[in-house]
């Protein structure tokens, strides 16, 4: 006899997730990031679309911009000028690439409650921002930069050579936007708005990717993008700085490139203002293992920028590429010359270092067999950063405070014990001088955003706790999740397993591997998600596993740089190794194992399917890379070097999906791609398909007309429905 369950009746009312739930975004969560405007004030858009100013210290709030004003121009975004006299309202949002978009901007005068008339902004604008002080405006229109002293003033045109697809001023070209900065802008105000720095990208010699956009017209349009693929000619970048109070006086002054960088092809990677008359630029050799940080000073007498060699700091990797995914950015201290920066220590873990004179004399601030991930803020006495140190789980993020005013510096974990079960993955947003900060917890429980005192770390209030989501999930049978590790041949493979709600170890389940696996990525994270794979576990009874193998991030350089110059080898091996280990666990039906991935994950899933192991019955590749010769120079060469005979051409050729066409004969393969993918071009899938046809290998395919790398909108629904059918058929699950 077994006792009847106490919650039996309640359990009967619980239901599994449906695909519809996922496609409708029924269980999406909210986060609250304050739009800080001072040490103790922030703006937030209320549920009814009023823009409200909150003062933490007085506890008062008031509407600075009504929803009526927002609606009058169909505004979807806003920006308050630092002097609080004006607000820009953004409407007619039109997406371009990952970050870039154009929009129409209206300026609203808060002092008289009217829109600024006269000298209105042109449309559409590619980028617009206020100066950090006052209400100067800088904007980019038709690839040229303009300046306004005040919103109602006539504009001053700073650059004149801007040309579509040729010269970009103040905004990046495609490759800098996606792979280097990565932002929609390439201009930076000095702290008090005296100077404006900007990048000019010359794409005149870059080969162009052209693809058809079918639209509704009789003839398709052709989209042309200067896009440097591996080994191709790259953009030529120059950095200029202009005095914004008197810009006509000497005009834009070019910032010199360090000699050791300028001697061959190079990239500009970031610009950080230190003071109004000191700026820090980061440069990178095209062979991305040498980075130079250059600190430059304004010379009043010559009205030029001087970058002495003594203020050049070199960062070099001998085992891989410089940095993690990107070279880290410096965070300057109050003396305006020393800075904090994350880079590899002698043991090969990324840690915070303090650089006062030379990189060789850097003082290591954090250390251990874990990694510092982001420096949020440096104040006079504290440094706030995130790391995955706590309890040795690489997929967690906690926020720490190091007291830099005292010696030895003391360290405190701000978040580790706040909501330990619910929250193990945090980010933070700080007000001026770190007087207050918001913590945003992404999981593993339901996300929650809270406000804290910057001195005491005391929680002041909950900003968003997702109560509606919590209530909605009460009658849902969510899958179980576990994060564990496998130790294989001195390699630690962390994995996340998503198990059906009534998981029983004595039964056999179909296994789906979800893979990304790109260099410096991390899939195994302690975050909350109710997504497609949650549905597959909850409703369809699948086990889903995500594995972080070699090449993934935040576990040291040995794992990260293992894939250097040989993409497509160890990432695949490690997925296969993990699958074998999962089979050994006894609850996997080894005749029903699938793998799927998107983008880099599509490349890995394709190679895994074509590995000849016989492990996988079927798999899906969405928008996969198929040859590294087809992908962007900046990304590809970082990890693979150049596709030249004297460099790494051999591995470029060996690592294609097409080279393994024969091996797809014994698997069911679903290949999916958007025809208007600006990032991983449709060419990649077209070549896979051609190779499979030429090898007379049967496969399934789906294209999405006029869709980009994200396959958004109605395509998303179609995509997940289609992939669900494919997997259910593969696993012999009834519809």
């Amino acid at each position: 006899l077994r006792p009847s369950r106490v919650h039996n009746s309640e359990e009967n009312t619980m239901r599994a997730l449906t695909l519809k739930d996922i496609l409708n975004g029924t269980f999406s969560y909210k986060t609250f990031f304050p739009n800080w405007i001072s040490g103790q004030e922030y703006l937030h858009q209320s549920a009814d679309n009023n823009i409200v100013l909150y003062n933490i210290e007085t506890g008062q709030s008031y509407t600075i911009l009504s929803n009526r004003t927002m609606k009058s121009v169909n505004a979807s975004n806003y920006g308050l000028s630092p002097d609080r006299q004006f607000v820009y309202l953004e409407s007619d949002y039109s997406k371009l690439w990952r970050y870039s978009y154009t929009a129409t901007y209206y300026i609203y005068d808060l002092s008289n409650g009217e829109f600024v008339r006269g000298n209105e902004l042109p449309r559409p604008i590619q980028y617009l921002c206020w100066s950090p002080v006052g209400s100067k405006l800088a904007y980019v229109y038709q690839n040229n930069i303009y300046l306004k002293q005040r919103p109602g003033d006539p504009p001053f045109q700073i650059t004149f050579n801007g040309r579509e697809n040729k010269i970009f001023n103040g905004i990046p070209d495609w490759v800098y936007e996606e792979e280097m900065l990565p932002t929609k802008y390439a201009l930076w105000w000095s702290p008090n708005g005296k100077f404006l720095a900007y990048a000019e990208f010359n794409d005149k010699d870059i080969p162009v990717i052209a693809y058809s956009y079918y639209g509704d017209e009789q003839y398709p349009r052709t989209i042309n993008i200067p896009y440097p693929k591996a080994g191709a000619k790259n953009p030529v970048v120059r950095i200029f700085i202009i005095d914004t109070t008197y810009p006509a006086y000497v005009g834009p002054q070019e910032v010199p490139v360090p000699a050791m960088i300028a001697s061959s092809d190079y990239y500009f990677s970031w610009l950080t203002w230190v003071t109004d008359e000191r700026v820090c630029l980061q440069w990178l050799k095209r062979v991305q293992n040498v980075s130079v940080l250059s600190i430059c000073d304004f010379r009043e007498d010559w009205q030029t920028w001087d970058c002495p060699k003594t203020q050049e700091h070199i960062e070099e990797s001998r085992t891989g590429w410089a940095g993690g995914f990107f070279v880290s950015r410096p965070v300057f201290s109050y003396d305006a010359i020393s800075y904090y920066k994350i880079f590899s220590d002698k043991d090969g873990y990324k840690h915070i270092h303090y650089i006062k004179d030379t990189v060789e004399n850097a003082i290591q601030i954090t250390s251990g067999k874990w990694e510092a991930i982001n420096i949020f803020r440096v104040t006079q006495d504290s440094l706030f950063y995130s790391s995955n140190e706590f309890e040795e789980y690489p997929g967690r993020r906690n926020i720490y405070r190091i007291s830099i005013g005292s010696y030895p510096p003391s360290k405190k974990c701000v978040t580790c014990h706040l909501r330990k079960e619910r929250c193990q993955y945090y980010t933070a947003s700080f007000s001026d001088y770190a007087k207050y900060y918001a913590l945003v917890c992404y999981g593993p429980g339901i996300p929650i955003s809270t406000l804290h005192d910057g001195r005491t770390d005391q929680e002041i209030k909950i900003l968003e706790e997702n109560k509606e989501l919590e209530n909605a999930l009460k009658n849902i049978q969510l899958p179980k999740e576990e994060i564990k590790k496998l130790e294989v041949d001195e390699i630690t493979l962390w994995y996340k397993m998503i198990l059906p709600p009534q998981f029983d170890r004595s039964k056999k389940y179909p296994l789906l591997i979800q893979v990304y696996g790109g260099p410096c990525s991390q899939s195994v994270r302690s975050v909350f998600a109710v997504n497609w794979i949650s549905y597959l576990a909850s409703k369809e009874g699948m086990v889903i596993a995500l594995v972080d193998g070699r090449g993934t991030a935040f576990q040291g350089d040995k794992l990260l740089y293992a894939v250097y110059r040989k993409l497509g080898v160890y990432e695949v091996e490690d997925q296969i190794t993990a699958v074998r280990k999962f089979i050994e666990m006894g609850f996997i039906d080894e005749k029903r194992i699938a793998i799927w991935g998107w983008s880099y994950g599509g490349y890995v899933s394709s190679l895994a399917l074509a590995s000849g192991t016989g492990l996988f019955k079927c798999g899906i590749a969405v928008a996969p890379v198929s040859s590294w010769e087809y992908y962007a120079s900046v990304y590809t060469e970082r990890f693979m070097g150049l596709p030249t005979k004297d460099d790494n051409l051999e591995h470029y050729k060996n690592s294609t999906v097409m080279a393994r066409a024969e091996y797809f004969r014994n698997v069911d393969y679903l290949l999916i791609h958007g025809t208007a993918d600006d990032n991983v071009h449709f060419q990649n899938s077209a070549q896979i398909a051609k190779a499979l046809v030429n090898a007379q290998v049967d496969f399934q395919a789906m294209w999405y007309s006029d869709q980009n790398h994200g396959l958004s909108g109605l395509s998303t629904n179609h995509l997940y429905t289609h992939m669900t059918h494919f997997l259910k058929q593969c696993f012999s699950l009834s519809d």
Epitope: S135, R150, P154, Q157, F160, T245, Y246, A248, V250, G251
Partner: antibody, heavy 118, light 108 residues
Framework: EVQLLESGGGLVQPGGSLRLSCAAS????????MSWVRQAPGKGLEWVSA????????YYADSVKGRFTISRDNSKNTLYLQMNSLRAEDTAVYYC???????????WGQGTLVTVSS | EIVLTQSPGTLSLSPGERATLSCRAS???????LAWYQQKPGQAPRLLIY???SRATGIPDRFSGSGSGTDFTLTISRLEPEDFAVYYC?????????FGQGTKVEIK
């Protein structure tokens, strides 16, 4: 409405000094570069001097460098031109103007006449 | 310094006619940084055009500017009685800023 009103002009002997003022209204004075431009009787226009919003940087035509000093008082919305060691060739109508970006001038005051003569 | 030469010195035209005023620079004016002003007797100059071709606020569209490098033109498409005045060009592409000597547009 933007208004600029110059004052302080008059007759002065060569070698003498004069201080011109320009009272500004109708705009955020502290945000703009301001300039002095002069026009000799029956002649063309000549830029004389400019000052940035903070007052920290000043610029002069070679013909007046070392003799003239431009300054401003943002709390009083007033621009000044201190003219020392005046010469006959400094005789002109002096205009103060809102100076856009160290570029063009708009608007201009009505001007004040400075006559340097013995 | 950049010397601006305006021509003709005087332009005699009737109302309704088209006026074309020229301004030539001794060296290239960078980025078309050129402005045009109108001055009537006993009055201060008034900005018409900046950036070689952008009309200032409140300026009628019969006034237009064009040109780049060393050659710039101010065109008044149909002269109105109030347009008879002296016109000055000014460059701000290099220091010091300089003005042309002026073109007088008078009634014929």
């Amino acid at each position: 409405e933007v208004q600029l009103l110059e004052s302080g002009g008059g007759l002065v002997q060569p070698g003498g000094s004069l201080r011109l003022s320009c009272a500004a209204s109708g705009f955020t004075f502290k945000s703009y570069v301001m300039s002095w431009v002069r026009q000799a009787p029956g002649k063309g226009l000549e830029w004389v001097s400019a000052i940035v919003p903070s007052g920290g940087d000043t610029y002069y035509a070679d013909s007046v460098k070392g003799r003239f000093t431009i300054s401003r008082d943002n709390s009083k919305n007033t621009l000044y031109l201190q003219m020392n060691s005046l010469r006959a060739e400094d005789t002109a109508v002096y205009y103060c103007a809102k100076d856009y970006y160290g570029g063009w001038f708009d608007p201009w005051g009505q001007g004040t006449l400075v006559t340097v003569s013995s | 310094e950049i010397v601006l030469t305006q021509s003709p010195g005087t332009l005699s035209l009737s109302p309704g006619e088209r006026a074309t005023l020229s301004c030539r620079a001794s060296q290239s004016v960078s980025s078309s940084y050129l402005a045009w002003y109108q001055q009537k007797p006993g009055q201060a100059p008034r900005l018409l055009i900046y950036g070689a071709s952008s009309r200032a606020t409140g300026i009628p569209d019969r006034f237009s500017g064009s040109g780049s490098g060393t050659d710039f033109t101010l065109t008044i498409s149909r002269l109105e009685p109030e347009d008879f005045a002296v016109y000055y060009c000014q460059q701000y592409g290099s220091s010091p800023r300089t003005f042309g000597q002026g073109t007088k547009v008078e009634i014929k």
